[in-house]
Amino acid sequence: EVEKTACPSGKKAREIDESLIFYKKWELEACVDAALLATQMDRVNAIPFTYEQLDVLKHKLDELYPQGYPESVIQHLGYLFLKMSPEDIRKWNVTSLETLKALLEVNKGHEMSPQVATLIDRFVKGRGQLDKDTLDTLTAFYPGYLCSLSPEELSSVPPSSIWAVRPQDLDTCDPRQLDVLYPKARLAFQNMNGSEYFVKIQSFLGGAPTEDLKALSQQNVSMDLATFMKLRTDAVLPLTVAEVQKLLGPHVEGLKAEERHRPVRDWILRQRQDDLDTLGLGLQGGIPNGYLVLDLSMQEALS
């Protein structure tokens, strides 16, 4: 093996080009200068190296930059990025959105890998918050990105960034995440008029409190059943039959099909049967006439 450490005569690479695909791994190691590789990283992307050869090229860069690659190299990693481990990426300082886009492009069409998750984490932490341009970029590549964040992480999203969020970006968010996002959305869209406001806020309503739902019921919004079913149960329960009727408008008929599912089921149990009957939908399970309803939570608060 000793003789293989020296580059054979005439094989020293003067530039990064297609001829290198014919080099054995030990020849790449011996004949490609790491500094040359770093300055011509953009060429690697256009050369069909084997994965084994890419391992050698990565090793050379690792030796040249033991503390982590500079951004000038990172931006041109191309598909060599797929060879990086999360540990490698944690050494990087990525500040340019263009660099982030270039690397996300390499992983496009695939699930978010641990490498990509680490890259995004490094980038966002470096910026201090999820600004609109970053959020735009991330949700374009990964529509489920927002819902992968913890409520704590979501708290760093400024209300101005909410404008970048599309309804599909929230599809997999749970109530705890929507609890954080809803107040930001309410703030972001506060200057819009009624119908426009509802179109924008609709996707976030899974985090809305009762008082906001009551306010919406006064605005003829005609909420669809899919949105209603995603509302917080605790926010829906205090709504009266009249308020729900106003909130849903013509979609109120859909309650019948959902009467066994939350939050409709739990809401029905809290309404007087007399009131439910006024809807003419045949909803059953309300409080029978003549029964007294004690609100125990109120009693506890008084004592």
Epitope: E18, N45, A46, I47, P48, G78, Y79, L82, V106, K108
Partner: nanobody, 113 residues
């Protein structure tokens, strides 16, 4: 999105074969293509490469003068014409595309015996 190789088979020494590498689900036009081979127990090695335009081709010393690489972008296919085949050319041949993304084919077996 994949590359599919075909054209492999059993051939006698001195014979010829033409391998094809076709793109499925993406367009080959913007990609440089490399042909590689791997014999049992050996390191995978580069055989030839062709630029995205087809204007630049390269060959490993061991196949120069015997193999020719070409491409037909209209058919989204790259070819490897292999003449004067030798027993040491026996291997699984696969193609790879590079140019922003990377695609590898599953390979096609060439046996010279």
């Amino acid at each position: 999105l994949q590359l599919v190789e075909s054209g492999g088979g059993l051939v006698q020494p001195g014979g010829s074969l033409r391998l094809s590498c076709a793109a499925s689900g993406f367009t080959l036009d913007n990609y440089a293509i490399g042909w590689f081979r791997q014999a049992p127990g050996k390191e995978r090695e580069g055989v030839s490469s062709i630029s995205s335009s087809g204007g630049s081709t390269n060959y490993a010393d061991s196949v120069k003068g015997r193999f020719t690489v070409s491409r037909d972008n209209a058919k989204q296919t790259v070819y490897l014409q292999m003449n004067s085949l030798k027993p040491e050319d026996t291997a699984v041949y696969s193609c790879a595309a590079a140019g922003g993304f990377r695609y590898w084919g599953q390979g096609t077996l060439v046996t010279v015996s």
